[in-house]
Interface confidence: low
C-alpha cells in the first residue's frame, strides 16, 4: 500500500529572464527513492538516480541545473516555459509517486510566489 505523499512548490510564478527552483518532497513513507524524473508536459528534463547522480536532457543542459537536493533549477526563463512540471519519484517498494507544479513566467517585474516552500 502506498502511504507516501508529495508536497510541492505548487503554483509559482517568476519573471522572464530569471531563475526558479522547482522542488518536491516525499513524506509519510519509508520507501527508498531510487530515481526522480523531472518532466515538463511530455518532455523529460532531468533524471536524478540514487546510484548514478544527475543527468540533464541534452536539449535543456544550457538552462537547467541540478539541485538543490532533488529539486531542479530553471534558468533564463522565457514565456514558453510557462506550464506544468512534474516530479516523478520512483521508489521501492511503493512504486511511483508524482507531484505537479504549475509555473507561470511573467513579463512584468512583479512575480509572486504562491509556494509551499520558501523560494530563494
Amino acid at each position: 500500500m502506498m502511504t507516501g505523499t508529495i508536497e510541492t512548490t505548487g503554483n509559482i510564478s517568476a519573471e522572464k529572464g530569471g531563475s526558479i527552483i522547482l522542488q518536491c518532497h516525499l513524506s509519510s513513507t519509508t520507501a527508498q527513492v531510487t530515481q526522480v524524473n523531472w518532466e515538463q508536459q511530455d518532455q523529460l528534463l532531468a533524471i536524478c538516480n540514487a546510484d548514478l547522480g544527475w543527468h540533464i536532457s541534452p536539449s535543456f543542459k544550457d538552462r537547467v541545473a541540478p539541485g538543490p537536493g532533488l529539486g531542479l533549477t530553471l534558468q533564463s526563463l522565457t514565456v514558453n516555459d510557462t506550464g506544468e512540471y512534474f516530479c516523478i519519484y520512483h521508489t521501492y517498494p511503493d512504486g511511483t509517486y508524482t507531484g505537479r507544479i504549475f509555473l507561470e513566467v511573467l513579463e512584468s517585474s512583479v512575480a509572486e510566489h504562491g509556494a509551499r516552500f520558501q523560494i530563494p
Partner: antibody, heavy 119, light 110 residues
Framework: EVQLLESGGGLVQPGGSLRLSCAAS????????MSWVRQAPGKGLEWVSA???????YDADSVKGRFTISRDNSKNTLYLQMNSLRDEDTAVYYC?????????????WGQGTTVTVSS | QSVLTQPPSASGTPGQRVTISCSGV????????VSWYQQLPGTAPKLLIY???QRPSGVPDRFSGSKSGTSASLAISGLQSEDEADYYC???????????FGGGTKLTVL
C-alpha cells in the same frame, strides 16, 4: 521480458542503401536513449549512433552524413538508415537500450543483424 | 585505434582473480561513467557493470568494477571456465560527444 529484435540486414553493393529496424518490447521505449553498435568480423565493438528520449542525436564521425538514426515511439521501433555504404561498414549491427540514459551504459542488446557490403 | 586502451589479452586459472584495465583521458573516463560488457563467443554483448561499479541484477558478485582518475578496471574473482570471453569497457566522451569503447580484452581460462 525486455527484448530488442533487429531486422533489415543483408547483402548490398558499395554505394547502396539499407534500413535497419529494431523492434522493442517489455519497457517504456519512449523514456530511454537507444543506440546502434556494430562489430566488424573479428573486430571489437564500435558505437555508431544514439538517439535520446527527447530526439537529440549523436553520431560517430565514421558515419556522419551517411547514416541517420530515428525512432517511432508509437511503434516502439528504432531505425538506422544507411546510405553510401562502404566495404568497411560490413558488420553485425546491434540495437542497444540505455541503462536509464546513454551515459550509464547499455543494459539490453539485441542479437544483431548482419550487413555485408560487397560487389 | 580505440579511444580507450585495454590489454588485448588476459588469462588466469580457475579460482584465480584477474583484473582488466581500461585507460582513457579526462574527457571520457574521468568525467563520465564507465560500463563493462562481456561477449561470449557468437553472442551479443551483455552488460556486466554500469556507473563505474554498479552490477545489474543477475550478474554474479564475482564481477566488480572500479574507477580512479582516467583509468578503470574490471575484476573477476573465483575465475570460472564460463568466464572465457571478450570484455569491453565503454564510456561517454564529453569532447567527442560520442560513446567510446575500448578495443576489447580476450580472457582465457587456462
Amino acid at each position: 521480458e525486455v527484448q530488442l529484435l533487429e531486422s533489415g540486414g543483408g547483402l548490398v553493393q558499395p554505394g547502396g542503401s539499407l534500413r535497419l529496424s529494431c523492434a522493442a518490447s517489455g519497457f517504456t521505449f519512449s523514456s530511454y536513449a537507444m543506440s546502434w553498435v556494430r562489430q566488424a568480423p573479428g573486430k571489437g565493438l564500435e558505437w555508431v549512433s544514439a538517439i535520446y528520449f527527447d530526439g537529440s542525436i549523436y553520431d560517430a564521425d565514421s558515419v556522419k552524413g551517411r547514416f541517420t538514426i530515428s525512432r517511432d515511439n508509437s511503434k516502439n521501433t528504432l531505425y538506422l538508415q544507411m546510405n553510401s555504404l562502404r566495404d568497411e561498414d560490413t558488420a553485425v549491427y546491434y540495437c542497444a537500450k540505455s541503462h536509464t540514459v546513454l551515459q550509464y551504459g547499455m543494459d539490453v542488446w539485441g542479437q544483431g543483424t548482419t550487413v555485408t557490403v560487397s560487389s | 585505434q580505440s579511444v580507450l586502451t585495454q590489454p588485448p589479452s588476459a588469462s588466469g586459472t580457475p579460482g584465480q582473480r584477474v583484473t582488466i584495465s581500461c585507460s582513457g583521458v579526462t574527457s571520457n573516463i574521468r568525467n563520465s561513467y564507465v560500463s563493462w560488457y562481456q561477449q561470449l563467443p557468437g553472442t551479443a554483448p551483455k552488460l556486466l557493470i554500469y556507473g563505474n561499479d554498479q552490477r545489474p541484477s543477475g550478474v554474479p558478485d564475482r564481477f566488480s568494477g572500479s574507477k580512479s582518475g582516467t583509468s578503470a578496471s574490471l575484476a573477476i574473482s573465483g575465475l570460472q571456465s564460463e568466464d572465457e570471453a571478450d570484455y569491453y569497457c565503454g564510456t561517454w566522451d564529453n569532447t567527442l560527444n560520442a560513446w567510446v569503447f575500448g578495443g576489447g580484452t580476450k580472457l582465457t581460462v587456462l
